[in-house]
């Protein structure tokens, strides 16, 4: 089972139809295709999940029939590889079905888009919503399956099945609410902004995985469990390392089936052991399924035992510090990862692989010299230094946060990023420093305590995103560099960049900063984005434009479009006043 | 740094077997992944099978499922290819190759930073 398959079934197909159930089938179905062909319509996926989900069951009736014994990229494969308009939709991914599995499964993985051309979910009246639900149940929430999975390539699908019966529940109960707006535009914000996060935060493991491979994620994993379960053993943590890489990597590489089973079989297993766990598991395993696993994924960080030694007796004092180095170095580093963490949930978990990557190195280095012992003594005090990096860089910024509040805050990000990364596209410096900048109200708000972990850890998984969305087309060699050396050290690599003293400004071009009445008619947060956009292509012009200058032209920003949207006649009023503006910011600004 | 040998290619009539040796040295601690490539001339470098040091667990290209066997002895630092009912279609150059951080995509050659020199077989009708 797994990426890596022992055959123990017959017919894997329907091995999976019967452990899952045909509605978990279907929608796992649905989601595999929608990632793996972003651009294709609903209703061709509905047709080949229908054909996929038949087939399965014929395979269900006799798993000796023919073709059942074929794999499920084999068997998905083919049905994709079926899709008419796969060359002209897609381009160089349909040369994919000309390979054999399992290169072909990889190949379309290769070809998912973080960023496809789709246009945005505009959210239909509610009475419009009501009676698509009611007319049809199960298209509308195929519909949101489809929609969400096309968007997110990388959505952890088991979750996005807890996602969809979260969504389905919010429309039973709204649609017979006297105030159906009131009952549902709530929850439905708070499912997307969620959803944005749940995506965000997979998209980092799969990018862990694909990059920097199962080492990087088993470590990343031994720290956030054993932070989250002190009380566990090390070999119990292990185990559970051990199963949660395997249903990651399974979902990472497609197999989203057998991820899904393996999620239920982790989920079972940990609710079976919680005494040797956590004692905070009570609640989730009370759960349904799709509940439970979820909330085991949320749950809060166990009491520390009480009592726990020094570290420094095992790790450093010892005399066999080298000897049982040296007799399996990755259980070594494992244990000293294990109990770092458990002693610190008030540390990243980022912080605490650099802190044993550096105890990594000193070992390798000391274990080789006249006196190991002499030599690494000191390792602890190595830890000093990064430990106080992202404790000083918080309380600066949480500070800076509380002063400017969030829209502000972001703000100084973007002018930040921007002199850092000017390549970068527009769309993507605002996104990420939109992101960046809710940092603040997440976790600055936390006791010094939660502070670091929750700031840290959030900030990986943003600059994730500008990972990924730079990859598809990378403009700066700068950008490369940190996101591609290091993993844990990408944050501290982004917030050492200086301005770029090497880029060319922008040429001046003013239809980037003119404006139409149709900015007043948009949301709140739709026209900071306007803002923002242009306070970015502000800087990309004058980088070296100081704060106050660049204050100065955006507060005449704002206060010309409260003006013109106040005016009778606002086209007019966006047409001359604007030119106003632009003249003036030139001027201000030495354009 | 970690040097891969491979040996053991050679000619051989249809139907018949080979096995294919890697030998590895320099570092290759319980993250590592093993893979076996070819390429036939005129057609780019194809995955072939991958094993996992550490477990063992193996993965093959559907054309070459239930006559090849992949294989790795650690204590040997060793990785084979047992080749069975071969094809003429299975005449190439074989490399073997190391990913030290077992990637996500195992088939994709890029992922492998360490390779062999590559040892020919060829099968004739």
């Known amino acids: 089972r797994g990426v890596f398959r022992r055959d123990a079934h017959k017919s894997e197909v329907a091995h999976r139809f019967k452990d899952l159930g045909e509605e978990n089938f279907k929608a796992l179905v649905l989601i595999a295709f929608a990632q793996y062909l972003q651009q294709c319509p609903f209703e061709d996926h509905v047709k080949l999940v229908n054909e996929v989900t038949e087939f399965a069951k014929t395979c269900v009736a006799d798993e000796s029939a023919e073709n059942c014994d074929k794999s499920l990229h084999t068997l998905f494969g083919d049905k994709l590889c079926t899709v008419a308009t796969l060359r002209e939709t897609y381009g160089e991914m349909a040369d994919c079905c000309a390979k054999q599995e399992p290169e072909r499964n990889e190949c379309f993985l290769q070809h998912k888009d973080d960023n496809p051309n789709l246009p945005r979910l505009v959210r239909p009246e509610v009475d419009v919503m009501c009676t698509a639900f009611h007319d049809n149940e199960e298209t509308f929430l195929k519909k949101y399956l489809y929609e969400i999975a096309r968007r997110h390539p990388y959505f952890y699908a088991p979750e996005l099945l807890f996602f969809a019966k979260r969504y389905k529940a919010a429309f039973t109960e709204c649609c017979q609410a006297a105030d159906k707006a009131a009952c549902l535009l709530p929850k439905l914000d708070e499912l997307r902004d969620e959803g944005k996060a749940s995506s965000a935060k997979q998209r980092l493991k799969c990018a862990s995985l694909q990059k920097f491979g199962e080492r990087a994620f088993k470590a990343w994993a031994v720290a956030r469990l054993s932070q989250r379960f002190p009380k566990a053993e090390f070999a119990e943590v292990s185990k559970l390392v051990t199963d949660l890489t395997k249903v990651h990597t399974e979902c990472c590489h497609g197999d989203l089936l057998e991820c899904a089973d393996d999620r239920a079989d982790l989920a079972k297993y940990i609710c079976e052991n919680q005494d040797s766990i956590s004692s905070k598991l009570k609640e989730c395993c009370e759960k349904p399924l799709l509940e439970k696993s979820h909330c085991i994924a949320e749950v809060e960080n166990d009491e520390m035992p009480a009592d726990l030694p020094s570290l420094a007796a095992d790790f450093v004092e010892s005399k066999d510090v080298c000897k049982n180095y040296a007799e399996a170095k990755d259980v070594f580093l494992g244990m000293f990862l294990y109990e770092y963490a458990r002693r610190h949930p008030d540390y990243s978990v980022v912080l605490l692989l650099r802190l044993a990557k550096t105890y990594e190195t000193t070992l390798e280095k000391c274990c080789a010299a006249a006196d190991p012992h002499e030599c690494y003594a000191k390792v602890f005090d190595e830890f000093k230094p990064l430990v106080e990096e992202p404790q000083n860089l918080i309380k600066q910024n949480c500070e800076l946060f509380e002063q400017l509040g969030e829209y502000k805050f972001q703000n100084a990000l973007l002018v930040r990023y921007t002199k850092k990364v000017p390549q970068v596209s527009t769309p993507t410096l605002v996104e990420v420093s939109r992101n960046l900048g809710k940092v603040g109200s997440k976790c600055c708000k936390h006791p010094e305590a939660k502070r670091m972990p929750c700031a840290e850890d959030y900030l990986s998984v943003v600059l994730n995103q500008l990972c990924v969305l730079h990859e598809k087309t990378p403009v700066s060699d700068r950008v490369t560099k940190c996101c591609t050396e290091s993993l844990v050290n990408r944050r501290p690599c982004f917030s050492a960049l200086e301005v770029d003293e090497t880029y060319v400004p922008k040429e001046f071009n003013a239809e980037t900063f003119t404006f139409h009445a149709d900015i007043c008619t948009l949301s709140e947060k739709e026209r900071q984005i306007k803002k923002q956009t242009a306070l970015v292509e502000l800087v990309k012009h004058k980088p070296k434009a100081t704060k106050e200058q660049l204050k100065a032209v955006m507060d005449d920003f704002a206060a010309f479009v409260e003006k013109c949207c106040k005016a009778d006649d606002k086209e007019t009023c966006f047409a001359e006043e604007g030119k106003k503006l632009v003249a003036a910011s030139q001027a201000a600004l030495g354009l | 740094e970690v040097q891969l040998v491979e040996f053991g290619g050679g000619l051989v009539q249809a139907g018949g077997s080979l096995r294919l040796s890697c030998a590895a040295s320099?570092?290759?601690?319980?993250?590592?992944?093993m893979g076996w490539f070819r390429q036939a001339p005129g057609k780019e470098r194809e995955f072939v099978s991958a094993?996992?040091?550490?477990?063992?667990?193996?993965v093959y290209l559907d054309s070459v499922k239930g006559r090849f066997t992949i294989s790795r002895d650690n204590a040997k630092n060793m990785v084979y290819l047992q080749m069975n009912s071969l094809k003429p279609e299975d005449t190439a150059v074989y490399y073997c190759?190391?990913?030290?951080?077992?990637?996500?995509?195992?088939?994709?050659?890029?992922?492998?930073?360490?390779w062999g020199q590559g040892t020919q077989v060829t099968v004739s009708s």
């Open positions: 190759a190391a990913d030290p951080d077992s990637r996500l995509y195992y088939t994709v050659p890029q992922n492998y930073d360490y």
């Open positions: 320099g570092r290759t601690d319980s993250a590592y992944r």
């Open positions: 094993i996992n040091w550490s477990d063992g667990r193996t």
